[in-house]
């Protein structure tokens, strides 16, 4: 099973922070995470690790680490805050579509761990939501 | 509120066992990464083990000091946390807090004491 | 495993001084480190992580700065509920280590 270096499950930084993420197993590694700019790869056999030295609100989210090669099929993650004051919010997409009656998953991640308690969700310019409709945040 | 409490300490011979517990309220437990760490005056704050969520394979850590004698474990049913510890050494006397990870050790009970003398 | 080596052991300031504790770890840590606060017989509160972020609550006479292998923790005009023990840890995997500790007390 990989392991991620830092070895937390939260990673808090600042707009402009250098963030490097290792991770190291016993065979190759892959990295899966949002797509957000400035990151650089580097894989050395079982070790890969990702960089930034200008880590912006658009990284935020859930890095994961897997060994494709283990029949186990672990894995690690970790997941990073880039708290902007100015950008509350990494919005992952701008359209979703759904069919009537299904459940809608709207990709919008925080940036700063301490919003997650006074968050809720309104329709634009503040009408309420349609009847019927139950929400959680994950 | 995050609420940690560690229960478990005593006194015990060398050579002997002593199991701790942490009993955890206030935050999804299943979810966090739960950690011990002791203190003593000649060691002052040491790393002793971690258990990962169950999202993490529920992996287990040790200092090389305790490797082979120390066993990290975890119930989220009861949202419980435990270490069991044995052949207890001398240099093993301290306090045992539990503590919670998430961007360092952002919580910690108030600890339990360990004496290990004969 | 990586060593962290804290400096100074101990330290006597006056309520109003500026003090900078500093950690030295023996490789690089790509920032990822706390710092802690300790009161006599209370367990440890966290101050800063990720090198440089204060944690919630923590009054921001406190900072945090550094990079690679070199950390330091610098306080403000001292309150007199500052004085107490501080350490220094590592979170670049396992195992875990801390700082030997620095105790700052009343001149």
């Known amino acids: 099973i990989p392991v991620i270096e830092p070895s937390v499950p939260e990673l808090v930084v600042k707009p402009g922070a250098t963030v490097t993420l290792r991770c190291v197993g016993n065979g190759s590694v892959e990295w899966d995470g949002p797509p957000s700019p400035h990151w650089t790869l580097y894989s050395d056999g079982s070790s890969s690790i990702l960089s930034t030295n200008n880590a912006t609100f658009q990284n935020t989210g859930t890095y994961r680490c897997t060994e494709p090669g283990d029949p186990l099929g672990g894995s690690a993650a970790i997941h990073l805050y880039v708290k902007d004051p100015a950008r509350p919010w990494n919005v992952l997409a701008q359209e979703v579509v759904v069919f009537e009656d299904q459940d809608a998953l709207l990709p919008c991640l925080l940036t700063d761990p301490v919003l997650e308690a006074g968050v809720s969700l309104v329709r634009v310019r503040g009408r309420p939501l349609m009847r019927h409709t139950n929400y959680s945040f994950s | 509120e995050v609420k940690l409490e560690e229960s478990g300490g005593g006194l015990v011979q060398p050579g002997g066992s002593m199991k701790l517990s942490c009993a955890a309220s206030g935050f999804t437990f299943s979810d966090a990464w739960m950690d011990w760490v002791r203190q003593s005056p000649e060691m002052g704050l040491e790393w002793v083990a971690e258990?990962?969520?169950?999202?993490?394979?529920?992996?287990?850590f040790y200092a090389e000091s305790v490797k082979g004698r120390f066993t990290i474990s975890r119930d989220d049913s009861k949202s419980s946390v435990y270490l069991q510890m044995n052949s207890l050494r001398p240099e093993d006397t301290g306090i045992y807090y539990c503590?919670?990870?998430?961007?360092?050790?952002?919580?910690w009970g108030q600890g339990t004491t360990l004496t290990v003398s004969s | 495993d990586i060593q962290m080596t804290q400096s100074p052991a101990s330290l006597s300031v006056s309520v109003g001084e500026t003090v900078t504790i500093t950690c030295r770890a023996s490789e690089n840590i790509y920032s990822n480190l706390a710092w802690y606060q300790q009161k006599q017989g209370k367990s440890p509160q966290l101050l800063v992580h990720a090198a440089t972020n204060l944690a919630d609550g923590v009054p921001s006479r406190f900072s945090g700065s550094g990079s690679g292998t070199q950390y330091s923790l610098k306080i403000n005009s001292l309150q007199s509920e500052d004085f107490g023990s501080y350490y220094c840890?590592?979170?670049?995997?396992?195992?875990?280590?801390f700082g030997g500790g620095t105790k700052l007390e009343i001149k």
């Open positions: 503590t919670r990870v998430k961007v360092g050790f952002d919580n």
């Open positions: 840890q590592h979170f670049w995997g396992t195992p875990r280590t």
């Open positions: 258990i990962r969520s169950k999202a993490n394979n529920h992996a287990t």
